[in-house]
């Protein structure tokens, strides 16, 4: 790690469209990028009537919005599709929704999907 920063070298990979895209459904993805760029992990999911459906997980490009985030947390209020990114190996294994609301007290809803997402 440089200056105490947690370097991302690999992330959990998931693709809900794996059959259409002809990829694996799950796995570990090595993260590559230019030497001067930071690397991140991400997760994208939907909440369908309270049921969590992961769309994608994998590596993410150098993005200031992901800097120094050890946990993968979505903070937008009720998005159609949830997205979070983080730094650190496999940091996208777990992800959560913690909306930043102006009036109401934030509530944490950690999402820990059951298999087959994590084998």
């Amino acid at each position: 790690a440089i200056l105490g920063r947690s370097e991302t070298q690999e992330c959990l990979f998931f693709n809900a469209n794996w059959e259409k895209d002809r990829t694996n459904q799950t796995g570990v993805e090595p993260c590559y990028g230019d030497k001067d760029k930071r690397r991140h992990c991400f997760a994208t999911w939907k909440n369908i009537s309270g049921s969590i459906e992961i769309v994608k997980q994998g590596c993410w490009l150098d993005d200031i919005n992901c800097y120094d985030r050890t946990d993968c947390v979505e903070k937008k209020d009720s998005p159609e599709v949830y997205f979070c990114c983080c730094e650190g190996n496999m940091c996208n294994e777990k992800f959560s929704y913690f909306p930043e609301m102006e009036v109401t007290q934030p509530t944490s809803n950690p999402v820990t999907p059951k298999p087959p997402y994590y084998n």
Epitope: F13, N15, N17, K20, D21, R22, T23, E29, P30, C31, Y32, G33, D34, F42, T44, K56, Q57, G58, C59, W60, L61, D63, I64, N65, P79, E80, V81, Y82, F83
Partner: antibody, heavy 120, light 107 residues
Framework: EVQLLESGGGLVQPGGSLRLSCAAS????????MNWVRQAPGKGLEWVAG????????SYADSVKGRFTISRDNSKNTLYLQMNSLRAEDTAVYYC?????????????WGQGTLVTVSS | DIQMTQSPSSLSASVGDRVTITCRAS??????LNWYQQKPGKAPKLLIY???SRASGVPSRFSGSGSGTDFTLTISSLQPEDFATYYC?????????FGGGTKVEIK
């Protein structure tokens, strides 16, 4: 310095075949996904095909599926596009472009392109 | 396939003007939105990736914003070298798709 150099374009009759090549230098080719994007004369950009860093995953636009094949030779730092059953609407400048990881395809470096003309 | 709609298709502006180009996706693409600049006879060049991140060497007058389905590319003070065609592109789902382009011309 990252460089991508396409070759193999030219004039071909409808129904014919061509193989485009893209020679990469200035970066670790085997660490990046690669893509082909085309641009018909006076038109916008159309993504054609993509391949991940080790050739394990490929993806195609519906317009070329079953006719075009993307491949790579990491030992030669070269990307290929085999184009069969060519049609007039395939006439375009074909660019190879570097991606990053499979899910975050921002195309950060592009070659200068090679012109493919399909005409009788 | 996800459709990307850019507006306007062309615009005329003067050096120093603030220019805004919009891009709308037919469904949510979260943060999977990139912007490219293309000059006549040249290859496209990546300007902005992941909605807001500037690519290497891109001047700070270029900025991106938005999320979900609606995105914006802003040039805060147009320079002579900025007259070109700009494309948005989504990478949320395969196939990758581009907007139709916005040509920025000299007024």
């Amino acid at each position: 310095e990252v460089q991508l150099l396409e070759s193999g374009g030219g004039l071909v009759q409808p129904g014919g075949s061509l193989r485009l090549s893209c020679a990469a230098s200035g970066f670790t080719f085997s660490s990046y996904s690669m893509n082909w994007v085309r641009q018909a004369p006076g038109k916008g950009l159309e993504w054609v095909a993509g391949i991940n860093y080790n050739g394990g995953y490929t993806s195609y636009a519906d317009s070329v599926k079953g006719r075009f094949t993307i491949s790579r030779d990491n030992s030669k730092n070269t990307l290929y596009l085999q184009m069969n059953s060519l049609r007039a609407e395939d006439t375009a400048v074909y660019y190879c472009a570097r991606g990053a990881n499979w899910h975050d395809t921002a195309l950060d470096y592009w070659g200068q392109g090679t012109l493919v003309t399909v005409s009788s | 396939d996800i459709q990307m709609t850019q507006s306007p298709s062309s615009l005329s502006a003067s050096v120093g003007d603030r220019v805004t180009i919009t891009c709308r996706a037919s469904q949510s693409i979260v943060s999977y939105l990139n912007w490219y600049q293309q000059k006549p006879g040249k290859a496209p060049k990546l300007l902005i990736y992941a909605v807001t991140s500037r690519a290497s060497g891109v001047p700070s007058r270029f900025s991106g914003s938005g999320s979900g389905t609606d995105f914006t590319l802003t040039i805060s003070s147009l320079q002579p070298e900025d007259f070109a065609t700009y494309y948005c592109q989504q990478s949320y789902d395969s196939p990758l798709t581009f907007g139709g382009g916005t040509k920025v011309e000299i007024k």
